[in-house]
């Protein structure tokens, strides 16, 4: 059974950094591209980033480009999101997800809340 | 970036009645593989999103056949033939044809009392 579990969220001051993790199990992690998607409180979904199955290719939303870095460790079946220069508008629940675009099933974690506040 | 515009933003529907949500993209969503990558998601209250439809009209396994997707180019529609209580939530379209991927603002489906 596919399982995605995010962790690392919390309260952080503006300008500071935070690293989110997503532990994957129940599937061949090394064969799948992985995404981060966020949702600000009471707001809609915003796609954040994708990383290719082997970590060779990454794309980001303009709002996080240059501040956030998506990475993965296939030996640990773990996806990461390194967030720096955090702003109040980065406050959101962050979800890791698999197969947003293609395939017959998509998978999402339960989300981890990041609050950027002084 | 490709702008995705959904309408309406709020949709009150009577149980058993049909519902229709529109999604317009600022650019064609035909990808280099020849497919149109327009995806629909449902997010029920307090839950993570889940994909309902991919490539405009392909239903994800396990999604009831009352959900259907249609459209081409820049105009797309999600239809629910007979709304049920469990369909309450927010519906989002997503384009997966151009970087960065972008979501629509969401359409909140509510049941009319």
């Amino acid at each position: 059974q596919v399982h995605l579990v995010e962790s690392g969220g919390g309260v952080v001051q503006p300008g500071r950094s935070l690293r989110l993790s997503c532990a994957a199990s129940g599937f061949k992690f090394r064969s799948y591209g992985m995404h981060w998607v966020r949702q600000a409180p009471g707001k809609g979904l915003e796609w954040v980033a994708i990383i290719w199955y082997d970590g060779s290719k990454r794309y980001y939303a303009d709002s996080v480009k240059g501040r956030f870095t998506i990475s993965r460790d296939n030996s640990k079946n773990t996806l990461y999101l390194q967030m720096s220069s955090l702003r109040a508008e980065d406050t959101a629940v962050y979800y890791c997800a698999r197969d947003l675009i293609t395939g017959t099933t998509d998978y999402w974690g339960q989300g981890t809340l990041v609050t950027v506040s002084s | 970036d490709v702008v995705m515009t959904q309408s309406p933003l709020s949709l009150p529907v009577t149980l058993g009645q049909p519902a229709s949500i529109s999604c317009r993209s600022s650019r064609s969503l035909v990808y280099s593989d020849g497919n149109t990558h327009l995806i629909w998601f449902q997010q029920r209250p307090g839950q993570s999103p889940r994909r309902l439809i991919y490539r405009v009209s392909n239903r994800v396994s396990g999604v009831p056949d009352r959900f259907s997707g249609s459209g081409s180019g820049t105009d797309f529609t999600l239809k629910i033939s007979r709304v049920e209580a469990e369909d309450v939530g927010v519906y989002y379209c997503l384009q997966g044809a151009h970087w960065p991927y972008t979501f629509g603002q969401g359409t909140k489906l509510e049941i009319k009392r």
Epitope: F27, S31, D54, T102, G103, T105, Y107 | -
Partner: antibody, heavy 123, light 111 residues
């Protein structure tokens, strides 16, 4: 236009070595995983090796593991297959192929192939 | 290793008719609801050409008369209506599990 040109094949004695090359053009080479597939004289297709787009990961079937090495030079847009301890059963047409992009996923489907280079292992 | 058995080994079909090629896997090639089965066409003196990926997805530029279906261990390639240029050998390939294996091929002749 995507183009893959295989070279380096030839006649080699059992136990010998050979290095195949595949020159790629018409696409961003560093964005794609690449594979080698061979076709035996009986027309049977066999997957030989795969290398991920960045070159971080390599995969082989047991039949060539430890004898063959796949590598790539993204600056030169070139894929390689170093073959060692060659056996008569390695005689085949060797094709380099591009792995189909799957929105970040590894699909294992090969969407473009070179014209092939023939390898004959014989004493 | 997963063994792929194609049938028939050869078939002759009249122009405009349907050609159906079967590929049976010795174990399931599905993963998370996705069928990791691909289909290729090979003409004499040419390399293989991808037709269908992930069981049912038509590769870009391939005519819609080609279609793939199936799941688990049973997969099918259909060509309808068959045209003269479809005379070739067709191979299935699974990419669910290392080593990625091919079927033995099906030779299609046009009557």
């Amino acid at each position: 236009d995507v183009k893959l040109v295989d070279s380096g094949g030839g006649l080699v004695k059992p136990g010998g070595s050979l290095k195949l090359s595949c020159a790629a053009s018409g696409f961003t080479f560093s964005n794609y995983g690449m594979s080698w597939v061979r076709q035996t004289p009986e027309k049977r297709l066999e997957w030989v090796a795969t290398i991920s787009s960045g070159g971080y990961y390599t995969y082989y079937p047991d039949s060539v593991k430890g004898r063959f090495t796949i590598s790539r030079d993204n600056a030169k847009n070139t894929l390689y297959l170093q073959m060692g301890s060659l056996k008569s059963e390695d005689t085949a047409m060797y094709y380099c192929s591009r792995d189909r992009e799957g929105f970040g996923n590894y699909l294992g489907a090969m969407d473009y192939w070179g014209q092939g280079t023939s390898v004959t292992v014989s004493s | 290793d997963i063994v792929l058995t194609q049938s028939p080994a050869s078939l002759a079909v009249s122009l405009g008719q349907r050609a159906t090629i079967s590929c049976k896997a010795s174990q399931s090639v599905d993963y998370d609801g996705n069928g990791y089965m691909n289909w290729y066409q090979q003409k004499p003196g040419q390399p293989p050409k991808l037709l269908i990926y992930a069981a049912s997805n038509l590769e870009s530029g391939i005519p819609a008369r080609f279609s793939g279906s199936g799941s688990g261990t049973d997969f099918t390639l259909n060509i309808h209506p068959v045209e003269e240029e479809d005379a070739a050998t067709y191979y299935c390939q699974q990419s669910n599990e290392d080593p990625y294996t091919f079927g033995g091929g099906t030779k299609l002749e046009i009557k």
